[in-house]
């Protein structure tokens, strides 16, 4: 890491350090030989997050309904406003700045993890033994029914899209 | 009352290292940089770079860059300063020392050293 | 980097004397300069700060003055304890740096 010039917190202007102006407010105008770093207080939906000698606070985010956005956390002086996804949406990236509807699991697979606000469904295909007969966001594969528990035989076998089909056992005669 | 102490005297080959200790007391390590000085036998000061002991940020002089190692452990509040491949002309008395708090610093580095460490004498000599 | 240059290198004065150093730095550094005293087998000891603030404890018959590029260390009656060696340094920005050295013996 090269030397630098100041401390922490402070930047180097016509050959002498100024203090940074602290998160939440903005560079006026640089120290003197005789002043301080001069700094104001961002506006109310304005904000600055580091120690900083900039002249412009930056813009809070806007979330915008009409991206299927809504606010997760307003913003201060100090911090940017996030944003997260209505119900049923997910974000399209880390900074979410639209959304995109939950994938649903087609027939054969299951949900391994519900979406939320900032992830998408994740599907697995059904094992043996499961099944998944829908296309949902929300169900996980079943368990083929248990002929035997019901005193039935299987009819028919399971696969991974649809149930086992239980009858009834053949009466052997004598 | 404020007080810095060194480790003790080392003597060194060409080519090893050197690691000395600065033991703080009587003030709160953290809000203070801690500096590290050194003078060669009938010679001047020289500044060799900081460390902030809060943030664990640290500020080399140049001629030093890639040499020099300042840390330090806040738990027992001490500053460490490691010089790597000694040579003869790093024989020297090295101090830690404190900077001077300057609450009206408006411009400046403003690092005055108000307390100083004994020193510890390095000697490198094959 | 900024040069810091004292002079002179070394002065022979009697007890009660007026002695003066000067420090010239290579650019301007505002007020922001130190004078520190050092006796052998010593760490130095901090007399001056801000080019002119007496550090707590200093006895007021040394003073300093200046800024921009031009300074001064001054002991207005030099004392037995005053025989030393005498730096300035610079604290406008790093890497801070200290003038050679001014030597006060006894004449």
């Known amino acids: 890491e090269p030397p630098t010039a100041c401390r922490e917190k402070q930047y180097l202007i016509n050959s002498q350090c100024c203090s940074l102006c602290q998160p939440g407010q903005k560079l006026v105008s640089d120290c003197t030989e005789f002043t301080e770093t001069e700094c104001l207080p961002c506006s109310e939906s304005e904000f600055l997050d580091t120690w900083n000698r900039e002249t412009r606070c930056h813009q809070h985010k806007y979330c915008d309904p009409n991206l299927g956005l809504q606010v997760q956390q307003k913003g201060t002086s100090e911090t940017d406003t996030i944003c997260t996804c209505e119900e049923g949406l997910h974000c399209t990236s880390e900074s979410c700045e639209s959304c995109v509807p939950h994938r649903s699991c087609l027939p054969g697979f299951g949900v391994k993890q519900i979406a939320t606000g900032v992830s998408d469904t994740i599907c697995e295909p059904c094992p043996v033994g499961f099944f998944s007969n829908v296309s949902s966001a929300f169900e996980k594969c079943r368990p083929w029914t248990s002929c035997e528990t019901k005193d039935l035989v299987v009819q028919q076998a399971g696969t991974n899209k649809t149930d086992v089909v239980c009858g009834p056992q053949d009466r052997q005669r004598a | 009352q404020v007080q810095l102490v060194q480790s003790g005297a080392e003597v060194k080959k060409p080519g090893a290292s050197v690691k000395v200790s600065c033991k703080a007391s009587g003030y709160t390590f953290t809000g203070k940089y801690m500096h590290w000085v050194r003078q060669a036998p009938g010679q001047g000061l020289e500044w060799m770079g900081w460390?902030?002991?809060?943030?664990?940020?640290?500020n080399y002089a140049q001629k030093f860059q890639g040499r020099v190692t300042m840390t330090r452990d806040t738990s027992i509040p001490t500053a460490y300063m490691e010089l790597n491949r000694l040579r003869s002309d790093d024989t020297a008395v090295y101090y830690c020392a404190r900077d001077q708090p300057l609450g009206y610093c408006t411009n400046g580095v403003c690092s005055y050293f108000d307390y100083w460490g004994q020193g510890t004498l390095v000697t490198v000599s094959s | 980097d900024i040069q810091m240059t004292q002079s002179p290198s070394s002065v022979s004065a009697s007890v009660g004397d007026r002695v003066t150093i000067t420090c010239r730095a290579s650019?301007?550094?505002?007020?922001?300069l130190a004078w520190y005293q050092q006796k052998p087998g010593k760490a130095p000891n901090l007399l001056i700060y801000?080019?002119?603030t007496l550090q707590s404890g200093v006895p007021s018959r040394f003073s300093g003055s200046g800024s921009g590029t031009d300074f001064t260390l001054t002991i207005s009656s030099l004392q037995p304890e005053d025989f030393a060696t005498y730096y300035c340094?610079?604290?406008?920005?790093?890497?801070?740096?200290f003038g050679g050295g001014t030597k006060v013996e006894i004449k």
């Open positions: 340094q610079q604290a406008n920005i790093f890497p801070l740096t």
């Open positions: 801000t080019a002119s």
């Open positions: 650019q301007g550094i505002y007020s922001w």
């Open positions: 460390i902030n002991p809060d943030s664990g940020g640290t």
